[in-house]
Interface confidence: low
């Protein structure tokens, strides 16, 4: 059981108060983290509270302002980037969000040597992406879907691509589906380590069907938003990878990197690019049927000025029980010999572990092993490998940082974080300086988050970067709910759950239960992290018990659990939520007449199917922006888990797993359906079809739409949403307002 800071600091019961919905909507109890912006082995930049950009040198203990808040304010800058030669800073303003990662902005270049903005050959606006070379101060940027290069900020630009066209050809930036489901970035260009070459992707969306939806705005006529968006089974983007020599860009122009023959024989994806040296690059490709991935190491041929990808440097990763990788196929971390690498993939027992590949995948040396999973490789140096895993004390929802000494024989393993602040900190990430001379640890909980700086050689803590003292003080008089993380063993399946209990929880009493579900493939909801959010309020003030359950399909507990849902979405995820509810009822403190379920996105899909399961367990439930049929969702994501919606593949389950097919079963539950009309991700179409099916079945339900809101339902919509859902649940549970 994890006891959250509650009455620890103050025993006087009457000075304590419950959380309010207003606390949550105002972000009163939000926390801060500190991620250094490393610029060398021992220096980092940080934006101070008063918006100065400050350079810190760990070894001298000195700090100085490299850019004043006055300069930042002069162009309304909200972000910055220092050139590696430290001569220039780009300042970013006029931020305009596009999709999850992408945005456009205006960029100004500030010359630190003379304290003035660079005049002449200014950058066009708005720019879709801009970055410095890793060495010096070359600039690459994307404007109107074309890539441009500047040797120096004041120079005229060299145009690298010319075929860029809105919604048709994307150079150096991903299209919608690659951004959301494959790269998870706003960029698709990569500098070589010393800035000699620039690699970039070209996405051709010419043949992709377009999703169109109305954006109502304030005008007399709504605008139509058009996005090339391949749904399951539709035509996909065609991707090509090019590399250009940035020293002499006009000499031979961009050179295409060949696709491995076994990949090119049918539809495929590019999944990531990793530079090894200035003249060696590693590309990862994936078949459209996403159980085969190929890692291809390519070398620059000086004589031909081309890139050669020999078959002997192709490494195949294949899954026979599911899809390749976890959520994404893992990326390699190369060692100092510039040919061997470390990579996370499934071992023979079906657990994701670190392997060392020197020649072939078949001869890979397994570095970690056990009935737990390695999750991320942070850094490989000459003598150490730093990674995170959930090994410690067998809690899958924890993350600790480990160091393996690869310089000594046999290699030894040390947990860097396990015993640092054991009660407070069980879920870490890390950020390393060059050569791992120093690193920052960011602890997310279960106690109040804290960020610390450490020596990369000794692991000694140097200083606290952020400890959220104000938050700690603010929480002293708050009755926070109790949280416990435990597991259920059902039919050889382990179901981990997090239960959030009212502050004065009494096992002899009966409480309404709310299940919060996400449940998507390779997700994890039961994590040892700190949060004061809507469900904290529901437990603290409204006396509800809230439970989160990680069922089949969820991550970091081995392939058996993960791949159980392969080609069968919407079955086991729902079953496992229902099984857990039955187990919770058996615990004796749940009022079985007052059980609800809610979820967002994939969670909205699962909550809808659970409500329509015909079990009679749920009195009511909420689906926010749910998927309703996998035929409506993005090809890259959907087909990874479901295959194709064709008769000779998996069409039957596509049809059987829709929410609409279960419309009749909503008759005996109270259902609240919510969606943003401008959702570019899970299209409003999904909820429109649920509503239509319910109307056609003459089933009563409640609904709320949010005009011009996307999948995140942000801004004032957030307040309206949570207020509305609170009223719905309180009414369902017969709680007075």
């Amino acid at each position: 059981i994890v006891l959250r800071p509650s009455r620890v600091h103050n025993s006087e019961e009457n000075t304590m108060r419950a959380l309010t919905l207003k606390d949550i909507l105002n972000g009163t109890f939000s926390y801060k983290t500190f991620f250094p912006n490393w610029i060398s082995g021992q220096e980092y930049l940080h934006q101070s509270a008063d918006n100065n950009i400050v350079l810190y040198n760990i070894e001298t203990g000195q700090s100085y302002t490299i850019l004043s808040n006055r300069t930042m304010k002069s162009v309304n800058a909200s972000n910055y980037g220092l050139s590696p030669d430290r001569q220039f800073v780009y300042l970013e303003s006029d931020y305009s969000k596009l999709w999850r990662y992408s945005y456009t902005a205006t960029y100004y270049i500030y010359d630190l040597s003379n304290g003035e903005f660079v005049r002449g050959n200014e950058l066009p606006r708005p720019i879709q992406y801009l970055c410095w070379s890793p060495v010096g101060s070359k600039l690459a940027y994307v404007y109107q879907n074309n890539i441009y290069l500047k040797q120096r900020p004041g120079d005229p630009p060299f145009q690298i691509t010319f075929n860029g066209r809105e919604n048709k050809i994307f150079n150096g930036i991903p299209d919608w589906v690659y951004e959301e489901e494959m790269l998870a970035t706003k960029y698709a260009l990569w500098w070589s380590p010393n800035g000699k070459f620039l690699a970039y992707a070209e996405f051709n969306d010419t043949d992709i069907p377009v999703i169109a939806y109305s954006y109502y705005g304030d005008e007399q006529y709504p605008r139509t938003i058009n996005i090339p968006y391949p749904k399951a089974g539709a035509k996909n983007p065609v991707v090509r990878i090019f590399i250009i020599d940035t020293t002499y860009p006009a000499y031979v122009g961009p050179q295409e990197v060949p696709v491995p023959a076994m990949i090119a024989s049918s539809d495929y994806y590019f999944s990531w690019l990793t530079w090894v040296t200035d003249e060696r690059v590693c590309l990862q490709w994936l078949k459209r049927v996403q159980n085969v991935s190929v890692l291809s190491i390519c070398d620059f041929r000086e004589d031909w000025q081309t890139w050669d990808c020999p078959k002997t440097q192709e490494h195949i990763e294949e899954s026979r029980t599911g899809w390749a990788g976890g959520f994404f196929v893992s990326t390699p971390v190369f060692s100092y010999d510039a040919i061997s690498y470390y990579k996370i993939f499934s071992d023979k027992d079906g657990y994701k572990h670190i392997h060392y590949i020197k020649d072939t995948v078949e001869n890979a040396i397994q570095i970690t092993s056990g009935k737990w999973e390695a999750i991320n490789i942070f850094r490989v140096t000459q003598d150490s490998l730093f990674y995170s895993s959930n090994e410690f004390e067998e809690y899958p929802g924890r993350r600790n940082i480990y160091r393996i000494s690869i310089g000594s024989y046999p290699p030894s393993k040390k947990c860097v974080t396990c015993h640092l602040r054991k009660e407070r900190c069980q879920y870490y990430t890390a950020s390393f300086s060059d050569y791992a001379k120093y690193y920052a640890l960011v602890c997310y909980g279960p106690g109040i988050p804290i960020s610390t700086l450490h020596d990369g050689r000794t692991d000694q803590e140097i200083k606290i970067l952020e400890e959220n003292k104000e938050l700690e003080n603010a929480l002293k008089n708050i009755q926070l709910p109790k949280e416990e993380i435990k597991k259920l063993e059902v039919d050889e399946i382990t179901l981990w759950y997090k239960m959030i209990l009212p502050p004065q929880f009494d096992r002899s009493k009966k409480y309404p239960l709310l299940i919060q579900v996400y449940g998507g493939p390779c997700s994890q909801s039961v994590r040892s992290v700190f949060a004061v959010n809507w469900i904290s309020y529901l437990a603290s003030k409204e006396g509800m018990v809230i439970a989160l359950v990680d069922g089949r399909g969820t991550a970091f507990q081995g392939d058996k659990l993960l791949y159980a849902v392969y080609r069968k979405l919407g079955v086991y995820e729902v079953e496992d939520q229902i099984t857990a509810v039955r187990k919770f009822i058996e615990m004796g403190f749940i009022d079985e007449k007052r059980i609800a379920i809610w979820g967002w996105s994939y969670g909205g899909y699962v909550s809808s199917l659970a409500l329509a399961s015909g079990t009679g367990l749920f009195k009511c439930g909420i689906a926010v922006a749910p998927v309703s049929s996998w035929e409506y969702y993005a090809s890259v994501y959907t087909e990874r888990f479901m295959g194709l919606p064709t008769k000779d593949d998996n069409l039957e389950h596509y049809k059987n797993s829709t929410v609409m097919a279960r419309a009749e079963y909503f008759r005996n539950v109270d259902y609240l359906l919510i969606h943003g009309t401008a959702d570019d991700n899970v299209h409003f179409q999904n909820s429109a079809q649920i509503a239509k099916a319910l109307v056609n079945a003459q089933v009563d339900f409640q609904a709320m739409w949010y005009s011009d809101q996307n999948h995140g339902l942000s801004g004032l919509s957030t307040n309206h949403l949570y207020t509305h859902m609170t009223h719905f649940l309180k009414q369902c549970f017969s709680l007075s307002d």
């Epitope: 069907p209 089974g233 035509k235 919606p645 064709t646 008769k647 593949d649």
Partner: nanobody, 130 residues
């Protein structure tokens, strides 16, 4: 339920014309290449026309090129085969087929294509005879 229903077959004199229609239901019509195959008595199925999804690229084998025209109407979920200058060797059962779209049309080799096609209709008889 997936259905492909052909119509428009019949008896026609050499040199004459026929227009075959195929009504599709039960799947996402726009995502599929559509094809017309034929099978003469004692022979294998052969592809006579194909039209891709989205970009309507057409394909014909040399034996029908210039005489047959395939078209589709995505809104009506229909695919058509206009057959002109018919010959006795065009006599066969004509099948409408839906093929999960790759960038190429269905394989010209009917037997190979049979394995990769999504759906088949029941067929309509075309007889060219004087």
């Amino acid at each position: 339920e997936v259905q492909l229903v052909e119509s428009g077959g019949g008896l026609v004199q050499p040199g004459g014309s026929l227009r075959l229609s195929c009504a599709a239901s039960g799947f996402i019509f726009g995502y599929y290449s559509m094809g017309w195959f034929r099978q003469a008595p004692g022979k294998g199925r052969e592809l006579v026309a194909a039209i891709s999804s989205f970009d309507d690229i057409t394909y014909y084998p040399d034996s029908v090129e210039g005489r047959f025209t395939i078209s589709r109407d995505n809104a009506k979920r229909m695919v058509y085969l206009q057959m002109n200058s018919l010959r006795a060797e065009d006599t066969a059962v004509y099948y409408c087929a839906a093929h999960y779209n790759r960038y190429a049309p269905p394989a010209a080799d009917g037997n190979t294509a049979l394995g990769t096609l999504g759906y088949w209709g029941q067929g309509t008889q075309v007889t060219v005879s004087s």
